[in-house]
Amino acid sequence: ARNGDHCPLGPGRCCRLHTVRASLEDLGWADWVLSPREVQVTMCIGACPSQFRAANMHAQIKTSLHRLKPDTVPAPCCVPASYNPMVLIQKTDTGVSLQTYDDLLAKDCHCI
Amino acid sequence: ARNGDHCPLGPGRCCRLHTVRASLEDLGWADWVLSPREVQVTMCIGACPSQFRAANMHAQIKTSLHRLKPDTVPAPCCVPASYNPMVLIQKTDTGVSLQTYDDLLAKDCHCI
């Protein structure tokens, strides 16, 4: 269930895809990745107010219980719903290789 | 990649499964669920320090970028890695029915 996409906190404040430009050094990958040397990291950032992009029944439960017990139960969290793949050239024991990572870049986001 | 399960913040402080007892009223389900009248909700709660139960490459990236830009990039978040199903008896237009929900109770947790 993909619930409301209207953000009650104002434009851009709720859970959505953001892009952060990062070097291999930033990512701690400089010792094993050779290319690309810069990555446009897409990640899910933002608040998850009541029923905003609720991923499933569990997210809806979490919202209800957070309202009741905010000190015990955290609000739902903005995380990737799916990913975009990315190919890296990486060092190996025997030389170099191309490797596709399917779980590297967020494609879209939901609250859970 | 399921990384370290040792919590550097002390026992029970990091991302793990918690159980919260909730009534149908707590969950906002009283108007459509008939049974069970109380649910032992299992959910994922706790901190996600560096590489603790990192779900995938994206979680590892998020940890690195959070360390660099804590005001921009949030730390990974404790969310369900899988779910346990639960059967509810619910009201329908024509009477009652049994319905299995596959995404209601967290089974185990990871950081993402």
Partner: antibody
């Protein structure tokens, strides 16, 4: 095996724009970067720019900055290169190629001949 | 911009004999990670370029082992151990250390 299939030849007037497409046939871009290069008649190769996953922002050669726009539509697995303010010196075969970052350009399109003539 | 200079401009070869092409860069292509950001491409008559060697010395998938790349810093060599008739075309070196990516002027290999 993925192939890059480019749009057909174009004849353009000086001052106009051209938009060349590059579609991944038999697959998607699947996490590879897309670079664009051109080759004037009888000349060598010249890199114009490229775009890396998730295909949000492109990197351009300074020479083409402000005149070239590289985009990609993942839903259709198609990359585009638009060159504006065309002049006769832009007459060339334009190639797209997939790579990892800017290197390892292992699959190339068949090329699109763009002729700029009044 | 990094200037890439190839020699010779033209190389007449005898099938079965070795051949060697030189490529010089105006500045070092050796990255601090120990790898040279240099590729070699072959453009056969009437065709698009094809990748032969990447990162200085790594043969691309499907490339015959008669092709080898060597060198470091500013001086690089592409060797063909035994030239075959299908190897004719223009060979280009390309630096990918910094943008703009630049190509050498090309070396035309033809059968004597």
């Amino acid at each position: 095996q993925v192939q890059l299939v480019q749009s057909g030849a174009e004849v353009k007037k000086p001052g106009s724009s051209v938009k060349v497409s590059c579609k991944a046939s038999g697959g998607t871009f699947q996490g590879y970067a897309i670079s664009w290069a051109r080759q004037a008649p009888g000349q060598g190769l010249e890199w114009m720019g490229g775009i890396i996953p998730p295909y949000a922002t492109a990197n351009y050669a300074q020479k083409f900055q402000g005149r070239v726009t590289i985009t990609a539509d993942e839903s259709t697995s198609t990359a585009y290169m638009e060159l504006s303010s065309l002049r006769s010196e832009d007459t060339a075969v334009y190639y797209c190629a997939r790579g990892v970052g800017e290197l390892h350009l292992d699959v190339w399109g068949q090329g699109t001949m763009v002729t700029v003539s009044s | 911009d990094i200037v890439m200079t190839q020699s010779p401009l033209s190389l007449p070869v005898t099938p079965g004999e070795p051949a060697s092409i030189s490529c010089r860069s105006s500045q070092s292509l050796l990255h601090s990670n120990g790898y040279n950001y240099l590729d070699w491409y072959l453009q056969k008559p009437g065709q698009s370029p094809q990748l032969l060697i990447y990162l200085g010395s790594n043969r691309a998938s499907g490339v015959p082992d008669r092709f080898s790349g060597s060198g470091s810093g500013t001086d690089f060599t592409l060797k063909i151990s035994r030239v075959e008739a299908e190897d004719v075309g223009v060979y280009y070196c390309m630096q990918a250390l910094q943008t703009p990516i630049t190509f050498g002027g090309g070396t035309k290999v033809e059968i004597k």
